[in-house]
Structure formats: C-alpha cells, structure tokens
C-alpha cells in the first residue's frame, strides 16, 4: 500500500501498486540545509552525500544531552521524503546535506547564509545539472536571507522552502517571504490545512502552493531500517523539492519561472477548505495542492499564467501597492482589490525596465492590493496604451492599434474619490472586443502584446441583480490573462484571477439596493499561443 | 581566555595595517540602514551581518571589515570578523557590541546591517 501522501501527488495514470513514475529525478542534485542526517539509513544510503559544511549554534540549556538519533531526526526524515527508496518522491535524485540546524532544530540566519554561499561556490567550482535547494526552516523576516535567496535563484538554482508552522502570514518569515523562493504550506489527507498543536501551517500571498505535510511516513533515525510519521511545512516543502527534481530531470532546461508555473498549473485546484484560514487571508492564499505532471513532457505548448498579489498598501490616502512578476515573466494584466471598496483603481507602469502593477488607495479606504497576472510568453513584446479621462459621456476607451498586437488586459485608474457612485453604467459597444472601456473620469490602460501565434478573446458574464461575486472562466485550451469589471458598478471591491477564472467581488448585497447599479459584469481576456502549440507538435 | 587573547592579537594586527586618519563619513548616496528581527526572542544581538553594496569586491569587503575593527579598537571595543562573504552577497559577519552600529553604518560601501537571528526546523 502506498502512503497517502505519495498517492496524493501522483496523477492517476502513474498509480499502480507501487509508486514508480518514470525517471526519478536522476539528473538533479538536491541540497538539504537542515540538521545532521543518518546517511546509512537504508532509505537514503548511497543517495545522500554529507558535505563537510556545518554552522550551528550551541544547544540551549545546561541539561541538554546530544543523542545522535534525535540530532539526525528532522534531516533524515526529509532526505527520505525527497529521495527515499520506499517512501521518497524522487527516488533517483541525489542529495547533499549541509548542517545548519543543531540537535534542537535551531540555527541562525548567518549560518544559513554561509550555507547558501557554500552551495554557490560549489556550483561555480563544479557545475553540474539542475540544482534544487531545500530550506526546511524559518525565522523572522530577514532582508539579508531573502537577498541571498534571490541571488542564488538568479544564478539558476531552484529554492524550495517551508512556509512555517506558526499559523500566521508567511510573509512575516524568511526565507518564506522571498519572492524568488518556492514557498510551500502543508495540507493533510483530507486536503485540509495542517494543524500542529495550537498552531499550524502558515498561509497568505507569500505561499506559492501547498503539499502533503501531515502524517508523512519517512526514514527514522532511530535505526537504519526504521520509519516514522512526521508532520510540518518542512515535509510539505520536501514533497515539492522532489516534484521539482522530477520535473527538472525530465526537462533540465526549465527556468525557475517555468518550473513555478508548471508546479502551479499541475496542482489540484480548489480542494483546500479555506474556512481554516483567517478571513482576510483567504483571498490571498493559493488553493493549490502540489502534484506531479501527468506526463513529464509536452507541457511546453501551454500558455502558463499565475496570479501575484502585492502586499497591502496600508490605509493612508495616497497609499499604493505594487505587484511584480518574476524577471522572465510578462505582466499581461493588472487589477486591484479593496475590502472597503474604496480604491482609485490600478495601472501598469514601467519600473526598472519592467512593467509593474500599481493599485491606488482612496480617501477613507482601508487599503488596496495590486494583483498582477504574470505569464510565460516567449518572444513577447508588450506595451501599455493609455487613454486619459474622456470628455464624452460614452466614457473612456483604448485599444491596441499596433499591427499584430492583441489585448491581454485592461486596467483603469481615477483621481476622483467616489467614481461611479451616481453614474450610469457604461457598456462596451458590441463588435469591438479588442478595446478597454471605462468611466469618462478614469484613465484606461490596455496591455497590448505581440508574440508569435498569440490570440486572445474577451469573455463576459453579467448579472443584472446584485451579487457578492461574479465569475467568468476561460474554456479548456485557453488561459486567463486579464480580469476586470465592466465599469458603472460603484460597489465593486475589485477583480482578480483565480486559476483560469476571473472573479469580480462586490460589497455585501444587503447594503446595495437592487438598482441598475447592482449590475455586475466580469470581463475575462482569454489567450492561447498557436506558436507554442506548433513548437510542441514539432518536438513530438 | 585563549579566545580573548586571539581576538586582541587580531585587533592589534588590524590596527597596524591601517593608516591613520580614516574617513568616517560614508560615500555620497543613501544612508545605510539597520535591520533586526521583529520577534524579540529570536534576536541574537552581538552578531551582525554587514551587507555591502552590490558591486563590492572581496578585497574591498576585507578592507571594510579591517577598517571597522580598527575604528572599534580606537574606541576601546573588541570585534571579531567571523566570516567574509563573497559569491552571493558582498559583506562580512562580525561579532561586536551594538554600541558600534552607528559607526559601522557610516563605513564606505555599506548597504545595510542586519542583526543575526534564529531560524528553526519546521
């Protein structure tokens, strides 16, 4: 019988009596920064090389006794989860361990930094295939630890970390808060967030995805043939490190951005019970549980996109929030969201040679979020076309006028505080889908992209009566790139993409009269790339 | 005792190798900032990561570390350079009194300084 966690991450076509997906990550080296490990355990013997790196603080307490099996417990279990013979995810992956945590599981930011530096130097001295670094640890927010992770990621290393076991916002911890790191929360056999004593898995916008992290069977350091069940976001991160090793072994040229997008794409969607998370964190927390891709090849043709939420802007009148995509992702659309509904929209703007998504708070607002739709679009040439507020009563409109450019997203930004409160809705003239429409007081921004074979279409879903939420989804084979609300609805809190669905949220309907202002229309822009599909077919 | 003697010896050597009249003001530009863990029990005061500006070479990192030691010694403080970073981030890890932070932040090439803190198995 295969342990529940391995079954959960395995697509049905791999499922047999034994968990044996093709190629076990043999081209990949996984570095583990953790406690010492029992390298002669039968699960990991010959698979894990213990480096001579050790940087740990002394154990606390005068009565602490070092017991080898206890000192090795955490690291041995994780090494087993990543690459163990019987209970490992990537059975072919080779590992290297660095000791940065003492026998009590405690380390320092500085020791971790020196460990990361050691990995970088090893990589320079002896370049090998793809590298995955597993960081099953967490401390308070650290600018320097996040910076080191960023540098290592930009050197082509995939870093995977535990979200933390503090039942708190993962953005308050490092390395979990580093945007370049793949941050993993923990779920259980019922796909529920893991509770650990009075605490549990961290959550929030800094978590990329969840993975099995409760009642995980793996190597026990009690003896060379022992197994044990352990739980935590470390175990969840180890699953993702194993999945990453499998993916990179199948496609060694994958970049970090491509790997992250694939991890998100192949995850199980909307299976986590969000009621476990604090209410204000539910919208920010990805409802994704990691899984192996159904086949190791052939995913390249798809247009991959993900949603990136900014930090909260704070409540001051001129406060803004900025959401950014990874260096090799394209920002295809930008939206905003405010729980109070008081916001002044959003716009795409250039910053350091890259487009970013900026949302603006309004007077009396509790703050806003910027939401970026970040996509992998090779050879893309994207620009933003802006129309200033119009004089005409029909409202402001802007379209993509350059030859071969298609509309991927619409944003609108306004200076007045109460836009649309007493204004009739503005409807898009039919037959003109390649344009963005907005209030006459708003400036409208169209994201226009040219990429080989890129085609997009607009899909709308309008509800005449007030609704707290209106959604519109892209059909199979199309990817959601843009999500916005049709103007004229004063009570709209904002719009954001969840997987391939555009969600437009409104104020509690009980506070809104059922007038024409109750009408809410969600507008999705769905795209696909014929070029990527053709390239994939040619490869096959 | 042995350890203290070692520190002292290191300081004397650092002092001898530095010329007098060191500039105390940072290079023109932004002021370096200090960061520490928001969770008090996790703080490790007395050990600091001094992060230097992005393009700083290893030789400059070593020079800046020695300069800090020399200036600290003039004020009667012992410091110990625990590690010099290069490869990922330029900088160094130093064991010193928190009283020296103001001085360290004024050193040339310094981008920011972070107090060391604990990390935990999850």
């Amino acid at each position: 019988s295969i342990p529940w966690n391995l079954e959960r991450i395995t697509p049905p076509r791999y499922r047999a009596d034994e968990y044996q997906p093709p190629d076990g990550g043999s081209l990949v080296e996984v570095y583990l920064l953790d406690t010492s490990i029992q390298s002669d355990h039968r699960e990991i013997e010959g698979r894990v090389m213990v480096t001579d790196f050790e940087n740990v603080p002394e154990e606390d307490g005068t009565r602490f006794h070092r017991q080898a099996s206890k000192c090795d417990s955490h690291g041995t279990h994780l090494a087993g989860v990543v690459s163990g013979r019987d209970a490992g995810v990537a059975k072919g992956a080779s590992m290297r361990s660095l000791r940065v945590l003492n026998c009590q599981g405690k380390g320092t930011v500085s020791g971790t930094l020196i460990g990361l530096e050691f990995i970088r130097k090893s990589q320079l001295v002896q370049p090998v295939g793809p590298l995955v670094v597993l960081l099953p640890l967490a401390g308070g927010y650290s600018r320097v630890l996040n910076a080191a992770c960023q540098r290592l990621a930009r050197a082509g290393v995939v870093l995977v970390t535990a979200a933390g076991n503090f039942r708190d916002d993962a953005c308050l911890y490092s390395p979990a808060s580093a945007p370049e790191v793949i941050t993993v929360g923990a779920t259980n056999a019922q796909d529920q967030p893991v509770t650990l004593g009075t605490l549990g898995t961290n959550f929030g916008r800094c978590v990329d995805l969840f993975a099995p992290g409760e009642d995980i069977i793996g190597a026990s350091s009690d003896c060379s043939t022992c197994f044990v069940s352990q739980s935590g976001t470390s175990q969840a991160a180890a699953h993702v490190a194993g999945i990453a090793a499998m993916m990179l072994s199948a496609e060694p040229e994958l970049t970090l951005a491509e790997l992250r997008q694939r991890l998100i794409h192949f995850s199980a969607k909307d299976v986590i019970n969000e009621a476990w998370f604090p209410e204000d964190q539910r919208v920010l927390t990805p409802n994704l549980v990691a899984a192996l891709p159904p086949s190791t090849h052939g995913a390249g043709w798809q247009l991959f996109c993900r949603t990136v939420w900014s930090a909260h802007s704070g409540p001051t009148r001129m406060a803004t929030a900025v959401a950014r995509c990874a260096p090799d992702e394209e920002l295809l659309s930008c939206s905003s969201f405010s729980r109070s509904g008081k916001r002044r929209g959003e716009r795409m703007e250039a910053q350091g040679g890259k487009l970013v998504c900026r949302a603006h708070n309004a007077f009396g607002g509790e703050g806003v979020y910027a939401i970026a739709r970040c996509c992998l679009l090779p050879q893309a040439n994207c620009s933003v076309h802006t129309a200033p507020p119009a004089e005409a009563s029909m409202g402001t409109r802007v379209h993509c006028h350059q030859q071969g450019h298609v509309l991927t997203g619409c944003s609108s930004h306004w200076e007045v505080e109460d836009l649309g409160t007493h204004k009739p809705p503005v409807l898009r003239p039919r037959g003109q889908p390649n344009q963005c429409v907005g209030h006459r007081e708003a400036s409208i921004h169209a994201s226009c992209c040219h990429a080989p074979g890129l085609e997009c279409k607009v899909k709308e879903h309008g509800i005449p009566a007030p609704q707290e939420q209106v959604t519109v989804a892209c059909e199979e084979g199309w990817t959601l790139t843009g999500c916005s609300a049709l103007p004229g609805t004063s009570h709209v809190l904002g719009a954001y993409a969840v997987d391939n669905t555009c969600v437009v949220r409104s104020r509690d309907v009980s506070t809104t009269g059922s007038t024409s202002e109750g009408a809410v229309t969600a507008v999705a822009i769905c795209c696909r790339s014929r070029h990527l599909a053709q390239a994939s077919q040619e490869l096959q | 005792q042995e350890d203290e003697d070692g520190d002292y010896e290191e300081l004397v050597l650092a002092l001898r190798s530095e010329e007098d009249g060191l500039a105390e003001a940072p290079e023109h530009g932004t002021t370096a900032t200090f960061h520490r863990c928001a969770k008090d029990p996790w703080r490790l005061p007395g050990t600091y990561v001094v992060v230097l500006k992005e393009e700083t070479h290893l030789s400059q990192s070593e020079r800046t570390a020695r300069r800090l030691q020399a200036q600290a010694a003039r004020r009667g403080y012992l410091t110990k350079i625990l590690h010099v970073f290069h490869g990922l981030l330029p900088g160094f890890l130093v064991k010193m009194s928190g009283d020296l932070l103001e001085l360290a932040l004024k050193l040339p090439h310094v981008d920011y300084i972070e107090e060391d803190s604990s990390v935990f198995a999850q």
């Epitope: 009590q104 405690k106 004593g197 003896c223 043939t225 352990q230 | -």
Partner: antibody, heavy 130, light 107 residues
Framework: EVQLVESGGGLVQPGGSLRLSCAAS????????MSWVRQAPGKGLEWVAN????????YYVDSVKGRFTISRDIAKNSLYLQMNSLRAEDTAVYYC???????????????????????WGQGTTVTVSS | DIQMTQSPSTLSASVGDRVTITCRAS??????LAWYQQKPGKAPKLLIY???SLESGVPSRFSGSGSGTEFTLTISSLQPDDFATYYC?????????FGQGTKLEIK
Amino acid sequence: EVQLVESGGGLVQPGGSLRLSCAASGITFSSYWMSWVRQAPGKGLEWVANIKQDGSEKYYVDSVKGRFTISRDIAKNSLYLQMNSLRAEDTAVYYCARDRGTYYIADGSYNYYYYGMDVWGQGTTVTVSS
Amino acid sequence: DIQMTQSPSTLSASVGDRVTITCRASQSISSWLAWYQQKPGKAPKLLIYKASSLESGVPSRFSGSGSGTEFTLTISSLQPDDFATYYCQQYNSYSYTFGQGTKLEIK
C-alpha cells in the same frame, strides 16, 4: 490497504504461557506505535500494551506488568505479545492495532500528535482455564 | 491512572434521531480523546480523533466535541447501520484507557 492478522491464541492452563503474533504489511507498519487491546467475553475494550516504532519504548496496563512482554520485529513486519503466568481473567479476544500518530517539531523538541487506533486485526481468542 | 466514564450505558433510539453520548475523564486530557464504533464479533472502528476530528471515510453525521474532562459524540441522524457499541478512549503519555462503552440499540 494495511492489514493486521493475529495468530497464536488458544486454550491454556492458569500459570501457562502463550505467544501472540500480529503480521502486518508494508512500511506503514514500522512507521507507527503498535498496541495490543483485549476484550473479555461480554465486556468492554481494555488496552494492554504498546510499543514504539523501533521497540525502544514499551508501556503496559498495570494488571499485566511483569507478566506480559510486547516486542516487534521490523524486518518481519511483526508484532508479538509474550504472555506468561496467565490467569483466568486474561481470557479475552486479543486485537493488535496500529496507533496512528505523528511527530512535529516545536520549541526545540518533538511533540507527538495522536490520532487513535486506526487499523485493527480480526482478533485471536485466548482462553485461560483448567 | 485516568478513568473514563461513559453515559448512558445503554441508549435506545430510532432511525433519524439525533443522539449524544457523553464521556467524562477523571482528570484533564486536553483534546486527546478518540471515539470507536464496534459491532458484535467485529473489531472496533475509529470514528473521531483528537476529540473532534473526523477520521477519513467516516460519515459526516458523526461529530465529536469537548476538551478537558467533558466530551460528547453526536450522531445527527441515526441510520440503521449505526446501531452498535461506542467507546471513548483517552491518550495520555503513551498509555491509554477506554470507557466502559455505550450500547446504542433500536427503540
């Protein structure tokens, strides 16, 4: 599916001995604590003993201490209960059960999170009578 | 040793009824309590762990609550398959005790 199969029960005279065995399947056996639970005819359940994954820790109900010994063989995926100095009141159906639980680290030490006995054998009958 | 006392010892009810079984610990056991169902001639089956967590595969009509010394098992709408004996079990530093059982029979 994890299965537990008990054997070794039978009729024995007071003061006699019996060795019960419980055969398990898969690595999931060696990953958890294991227990023996008994049920006297027409009575309720009574926990008898349990043993850690590696056999390094064992606990017993007071009434069997010094008479019963729990052990396990990881290589054979088996659990045992050696019963000596048997008494009439030891007459019961004996079940082996898996104690599902997990360890998590917090504040520098491991904590144990217990779920309960989630897999049980079909039971083996022990009758102590002269 | 911690004693577990279940009440009632026997409970008569009809299909569709909502029934509650109580378990009291002689000292605080936090939330370390499990509930089992046993049918004649069969091994017990785990229903609830950690006082209120539903074991995988168990129907949602079963629920548990309580902490400290007072615990309850509730069956929201009795089904014919639910007539059995129910046991609570406490876990305290690796040694366990069961309640004496509650027999749920058809009225």
